[in-house]
Interface confidence: low
Amino acid sequence: NQDLPVIKCVLINHKNNDSSVGKSSSYPMVSESPEDLGCALRPQSSGTVYEAAAVEVDVSASITLQVLVDAPGNISCLWVFKHSSLNCQPHFDLQNRGVVSMVILKMTETQAGEYLLFIQSEATNYTILFTVSIRNTLLYTLRRPYFRKMENQDALVCISESVPEPIVEWVLCDSQGESCKEESPAVVKKEEKVLHELFGTDIRCCARNELGRECTRLFTIDLNQTPQTTLPQLFLKVGEPLWIRCKAVHVNHGFGLTWELENKALEEGNYFEMSTYSTNRTMIRILFAFVSSVARNDTGYYTCSSSKHPSQSALVTIVEKGFINATNSSEDYEIDQYEEFCFSVRFKAYPQIRCTWTFSRKSFPCEQKGLDNGYSISKFCNHKHQPGEYIFHAENDDAQFTKMFTLNIRRKPQVLAEASASQASCFSDGYPLPSWTWKKCSDKSPNCTEEITEGVWNRKANRKVFGQWVSSSTLNMSEAIKGFLVKCCAYNSLGTSCETILLNSPGPFPFIQDNIS
């Protein structure tokens, strides 16, 4: 079929010069020469489907899947991977070919699979299929750590069933809130699997290997703290171990702690107590409730009671499968050039998510903050006032979530013009999208006030260049205007900008730019 576009599929391997684990680098710096993946038409397929040669990638390698399309006019595209779709931004190379890229940073098991690229051009629609797999037969994994009680000892063992064997560390903090951030001087790290000092305020265990770092916090109810406004909630999957620590401090040893599930005392063997005197001679008691492998019927309100403190509860919810709950509707924002603004996504998820923010094929690190109501929030403020599409992507072992944001920056239009033998075209960014007027400059109208309405063709911005909306207006040449100066003007609520063009030669000849505010 002669209407079919000429397609080239390539793989670019990036040498990661940032080999640190778990960092989201923007774009891998050093590239090897592209490898042609063929992209042959797939026989007996409904619709036009091109299939690239299978791609095998080393764990933690960074690659780009790239498609070059030699088709007339604009193209739009969409990537689909594991039931998630991701809009893509085609750009054009020096030979005016459409270029569509998918960057995979630090390849992991979850990023292996089929990548489908849907392309829509003015002439036709077609699909390109990439299959990406991990080269290594020994698939790397990094599993969230969990706790076990040490046989015959009052100590916790931290276990992470990961490959390669992870380094396990306990992260301990004895102060409250913000001062327990990872880099804080209040934080103590112990690179060992067994922890005997279980009286601290905040106890986490982290496991790290080539794939990154995963942490699990020891869920704690502190009877000396004012309870949260909303009941703390703990999610677990069927089969996972449950650990809740109840902690209380009193002036002397004359108090006891008990655990109840839905007003029924926990069975022996599902709890153990430890106590110690603190430096000021007050007594600290902790009582652990634990279930080595939870079932659906372990769901409910776990209440820790003390003979000397008000009791507090936590809601434990056992789920069959992990989840990510958040609204995935896309959001559009319009801000001024110097306005402070952050994108934010509020979500509830279990297990904890891994996430990235992406803009213009660059990935940015994603931070999560837990809120008091059981929700978490991720904010992205590093947009540098660049308009375009921003993508938040989150995943855990069982679920994936993608949310699109559009950022528009209110600014006055800037006009660029070009002319050919048969037409003159003007382009403008600026937001809100500008409207266009064309004017003819002549003896009768030396101030170029004579409006041209014939032969004008305005195009809505249907393509982004570097994240900016572009609007264009084209004037088809007629005998009536040949040899004259014409002026195209773009205007929006923030101002007007014009460009003057001489319509007598095939080359572009803009020579005056007017900026009228």
């Epitope: 290594n136 020994l138 490959v163 390669p164 064997e165 790290k189 112990k190 690179e191 060992e192």
Partner: antibody, heavy 125, light 107 residues
Framework: QVQLVQSGAEVKKPGSSVKVSCKAS????????MHWVRQAPGQGLEWVGG????????FYAQTFQGRVTITADESTSTAYMELSSLRSEDTAVYYC??????????????????WGQGTLVTVSS | DIQMTQSPSSLSASVGDRVTITCRAS??????LNWYQQKPGKAPKLLIY???NLQSGVPSRFSGSGSGTDFTLTISSLQPEDFATYYC?????????FGQGTRLEIK
């Protein structure tokens, strides 16, 4: 080349302490581990403990827990092993050994690739 | 702690012989197992790491195999300088533990 030079032989009384030093040359103490291993006369090798000099994190065998202290001074590239409450069964040659981390088929493996010449500690009344 | 047991405790062989020493762990140590050679009055020397990888500078007549709990050190053709004591050691988890050693003597 990489060398580990240990302090000289020691004769100690039961109940006292001994501190053995191990100076690294040809590399700085920024490798992942520095280990201490002992060997009683005519016996096999026994791991005493190890330290990650960069962080000061220590690991000890249960047998020595509470009696042994391993430290490292990065500025002088020297590691130390102090053993207290000495008893006659602590008589042994004590070796320091540099930890090595080697990659093969998707995993990192840890071993001890460079050893000191050994320090004989004799505990006798 | 993980116990490491070597067999035999000692063995006699001649130059040119093929010799096999085995090491068993009390629980799985995956492939995190090293072999060392020690000569009288000398410090041990690392021969094999990760169960089967030859340490640089070690002759190719030495080889290692196994994973999980059972491991083997093989010397394909004994040389006079190979008569020594050999130790296996797990680095799967601290405390690192050694086998009791296998003494290889000249027949």
């Amino acid at each position: 080349q990489v060398q580990l030079v240990q302090s000289g032989a020691e004769v100690k009384k039961p109940g006292s302490s001994v501190k053995v030093s191990c100076k690294a040359s040809g590399y700085t103490l920024n490798e992942l581990f520095m280990h201490w291993v002992r060997q009683a006369p005519g016996q096999g090798l026994e791991w005493v403990g190890g330290i990650i000099p960069m962080s000061g994190t220590t690991f000890y065998a249960q047998t020595f827990q509470g009696r042994v202290t391993i430290t490292a001074d990065e500025s002088t590239s020297t590691a130390y092993m102090e053993l207290s409450s000495l008893r006659s069964e602590d008589t042994a040659v004590y070796y320091c050994a540099k930890g090595v981390r080697q990659y093969s088929y998707g995993r990192y493996y840890y071993g001890m690739d460079v050893w000191g010449q050994g320090t004989l500690v004799t505990v006798s009344s | 702690d993980i116990q490491m047991t070597q067999s035999p405790s000692s063995l006699s062989a001649s130059v040119g012989d093929r010799v096999t020493i085995t090491c068993r762990a009390s629980q799985s140590v995956s492939s995190y197992l090293n072999w060392y050679q020690q000569k009288p009055g000398k410090a041990p020397k690392l021969l094999i790491y990760g169960a089967s990888n030859l340490q640089s500078g070690v002759p190719s007549r030495f080889s290692g195999s196994g994973s999980g709990t059972d491991f083997t050190l093989t010397i394909s053709s004994l040389q006079p300088e190979d008569f020594a004591t050999y130790y296996c050691q797990q680095s799967y988890t601290t405390p690192w533990t050694f086998g009791q050693g296998t003494r290889l003597e000249i027949k």
